[in-house]
C-alpha cells in the first residue's frame, strides 16, 4: 500500500504561529508502542502455497537498521501434492513503510524520514488471462 | 516482521559530543524517496486464493494519516472451482511499520515515532496438524 505525499501541512505549525526555523522540527526521543509484538514466528513463509525467502539489508545509519525483504521462491504456486502449479502465480505483497535516516557531520546530527518499499510476503493468485495480439 | 528496539544509541550523538537537549532531536522536513511507487499486481486482494478486504483508518495527527489494514475474507482458501477449501487456511501477513505522531500545545509542535502493526494481505498455508492444548 502507498503512503500519500506529505503535502505542505502535516509538519508545519498552524498559520498563526511563527514558522519552523531552518526547515527542521523537533522529534521526541523514544517510540510509542515500542513493545508491541508481532505473532509471526510461525514460518508461514515455508508453509504458504506461494512460499518465500527472506533477505536482510543492514544500514547502521537507518532506523530500523535491519530491513527484511521477501522474495517469492516460485513463479507458480505449490499444490496439495507439493508440486508447482504453473496455472497459478506467486506474487509479492508490497508495503511502503517509513524509516529514519541519520545524517551527521561531526557533532551535528539530524534525522530525516525516508520511504522504503518492503516486500512483506507472497500470495497465490489466479492470473488475469488476456491475449495481446 | 518485527522492528527491533531503539536501544540507546541510534538517536544519540557520539559520546564526545554534548548531549541532545530536552530529550528531543532535529528532524529535517521532507521525505527521502517520496515519489517512489508501489508496483503491486492489480487487485491481487480479489484474485488471491486467500482473498482480503481493506479497511482504512484515518488520523489527522499521524503521518501517514491514512493506514490501510487488510482482513482475510475467509478461514479457508479458494480453490480452482471458486469454492472454499477448508483443509487450507488463509492467514494474515503482518508487518511492523513506523508512523509519525504529531503532538501540539498551541504553537509548540513536536513529533514522535510510533510503531504500528499492519496486516498487509493474506496468504494460503498448509497448517501443521496437531493439537496444542
Amino acid at each position: 500500500r502507498k503512503i500519500p505525499k506529505v503535502g505542505h501541512t502535516f509538519f508545519q505549525k498552524p498559520e498563526s504561529c511563527p514558522p519552523v526555523p531552518g526547515g527542521s522540527m523537533k522529534l521526541d526521543i523514544g517510540i510509542i508502542n515500542e513493545n508491541q509484538r508481532v505473532s509471526m514466528s510461525r514460518n508461514i513463509e515455508s508453509r504458504s502455497t506461494s512460499p518465500w525467502n527472506y533477505t536482510v539489508t543492514w544500514d547502521p545509519n537507518r532506523y530500523p537498521s535491519e530491513v527484511v525483504q521477501a522474495q517469492c521462491r516460485n513463479l507458480g504456486c505449490i499444490n496439495a501434492q507439493g508440486k508447482e502449479d504453473i496455472s497459478m502465480n506467486s506474487v509479492p505483497i508490497q508495503q511502503e513503510t517509513l524509516v529514519v535516516r541519520r545524517k551527521h557531520q561531526g557533532c551535528s546530527v539530524s534525522f530525516q524520514l525516508e520511504k522504503v518499499l518492503v516486500t512483506v510476503g507472497c500470495t497465490c493468485v489466479t492470473p488475469v488471462i488476456h491475449h495481446v495480439q | 516482521r518485527k522492528i527491533p528496539k531503539v536501544g540507546h544509541t541510534f538517536f544519540q550523538k557520539p559520546e564526545s559530543c554534548p548531549p541532545v537537549p530536552g530529550g528531543s532531536m532535529k528532524l529535517d522536513i521532507g521525505i527521502i524517496n517520496e515519489n517512489q511507487r508501489v508496483s503491486m499486481s492489480r487487485n491481487i486482494e480479489s484474485r488471491s486464493t486467500s482473498p482480503w478486504n481493506y479497511t482504512v483508518t484515518w488520523d489527522p495527527n499521524r503521518y501517514p494519516s491514512e493506514v490501510v489494514q487488510a482482513q482475510c475474507r475467509n478461514l479457508g482458501c479458494i480453490n480452482a472451482q471458486g469454492k472454499e477449501d477448508i483443509s487450507m487456511n488463509s492467514v494474515p501477513i503482518q508487518q511492523e511499520t513506523l508512523v509519525v505522531r504529531r503532538k501540539h500545545q498551541g504553537c509548540s509542535v513536536s513529533f514522535q515515532l510510533e510503531k504500528v502493526l499492519v496486516t498487509v494481505g493474506c496468504t494460503c498455508v498448509t497448517p501443521v496438524i496437531h493439537h496444542v492444548q
Epitope: - | 482482513q71 475474507r73 477448508i86 494474515p92 496486516t119 497448517p127 501443521v128 496438524i129 496444542v132 492444548q133
Partner: antibody
Framework: QVQLVQSGAEVKKPGASVKVSCKAS????????MHWVKQAPGQRLEWMGG????????SYNQNFKGKATLTVDTSASTAYMELSSLRSEDTAVYYC????????????????WGQGTTVTVSS | EIVLTQSPGTLSLSPGERATLSCRAS???????LAWYQQKPGQAPRLLIY???SRATGIPDRFSGSGSGTDFTLTISRLEPEDFAVYYC????????FGQGTKLEIK
C-alpha cells in the same frame, strides 16, 4: 484452563432475531478461531460457520448464509452468533467451539466447546 | 458434500467389554481431517481423537482411532461405566460434516 461460557436460554417468536454470546477465557482469544455448531432435536450436529478474531476472516456453511451472522468483540474476548428471521426449525442447542490457530492447527480443528445455548422458537 | 454414516446406530455392551464403532465416508477423506467426539446427555461434545488416530489431551489410552480413505474406526478396548454416551465422527476435508452418531448403551 480453556473455558467457553455461553449466554442463557432464549425463547423467541417466529420472525424475530436472537444473539447468542460466548465468553472465552484461559487462552489468547485473538489467536484461535471460534466456530458455531447447531444441534437440533433428533438431528446430527451441523457446523454453521467460524470466525478468526485476528484476521477478520469468516466462513459459513452454505445452509446458514443469510441466516447466521458471526462477530467478535476482541476487547471482551467474546464471540457472537446472531440468527435472523427465526422459524420453528431454528429451535436447537447452539454451541460455540474453539478451532485452531491456522498455523500449528487447522482453523477447523475444534477442541473445546461451550456448554450450549438452547434457542426455542415458538408462537 | 461428504456424508458420514456411522454404524451401528446403537451398541449395547457391558462394562469391561470391547467396543468397535464404525464411520464410513461417501468419498475419501484425508486422515488428517477426521475426528471423533463423545457426548453425554445435557453436555457439550468432547474431542477424543483427531487426525483419525491421535488422542486428544487427557483422553485415556483405552480410546484409539484407526482407518483411512472411507473407513474409520473408534475402538474402546475395555469399557468403563463413564464411557456410555453418544459418539460422533466428523470430517472437514471437504465441507464440514458430522456422522449421525452411535449410541453406546449399557446392556
Amino acid at each position: 484452563q480453556v473455558q467457553l461460557v455461553q449466554s442463557g436460554a432464549e425463547v423467541k417468536k417466529p420472525g424475530a432475531s436472537v444473539k447468542v454470546s460466548c465468553k472465552a477465557s484461559g487462552y489468547t482469544f485473538n489467536e484461535y478461531t471460534m466456530h458455531w455448531v447447531k444441534q437440533a432435536p433428533g438431528q446430527r450436529l451441523e457446523w454453521m460457520g467460524g470466525i478468526n478474531p485476528n484476521s477478520g476472516g469468516v466462513s459459513y456453511n452454505q445452509n446458514f448464509k443469510g441466516k447466521a451472522t458471526l462477530t467478535v468483540d476482541t476487547s471482551a474476548s467474546t464471540a457472537y452468533m446472531e440468527l435472523s428471521s427465526l422459524r420453528s426449525e431454528d429451535t436447537a442447542v447452539y454451541y460455540c467451539a474453539r478451532g485452531g490457530d491456522g498455523y500449528y492447527t487447522n482453523y477447523f480443528d475444534i477442541d473445546y466447546w461451550g456448554q450450549g445455548t438452547t434457542v426455542t422458537v415458538s408462537s | 458434500e461428504i456424508v458420514l454414516t456411522q454404524s451401528p446406530g446403537t451398541l449395547s455392551l457391558s462394562p469391561g467389554e470391547r467396543a468397535t464403532l464404525s464411520c464410513r465416508a461417501s468419498q475419501s477423506v484425508s486422515s488428517s481431517y477426521l475426528a471423533w467426539y463423545q457426548q453425554k446427555p445435557g453436555q457439550a461434545p468432547r474431542l477424543l481423537i483427531y487426525g483419525a488416530s491421535s488422542r486428544a489431551t487427557g483422553i485415556p489410552d483405552r480410546f484409539s482411532g484407526s482407518g483411512s480413505g472411507t473407513d474409520f474406526t473408534l475402538t474402546i478396548s475395555r469399557l468403563e461405566p463413564e464411557d456410555f454416551a453418544v459418539y460422533y465422527c466428523q470430517q472437514y476435508g471437504s465441507s464440514y460434516t458430522f456422522g449421525q452418531g452411535t449410541k453406546l448403551e449399557i446392556k
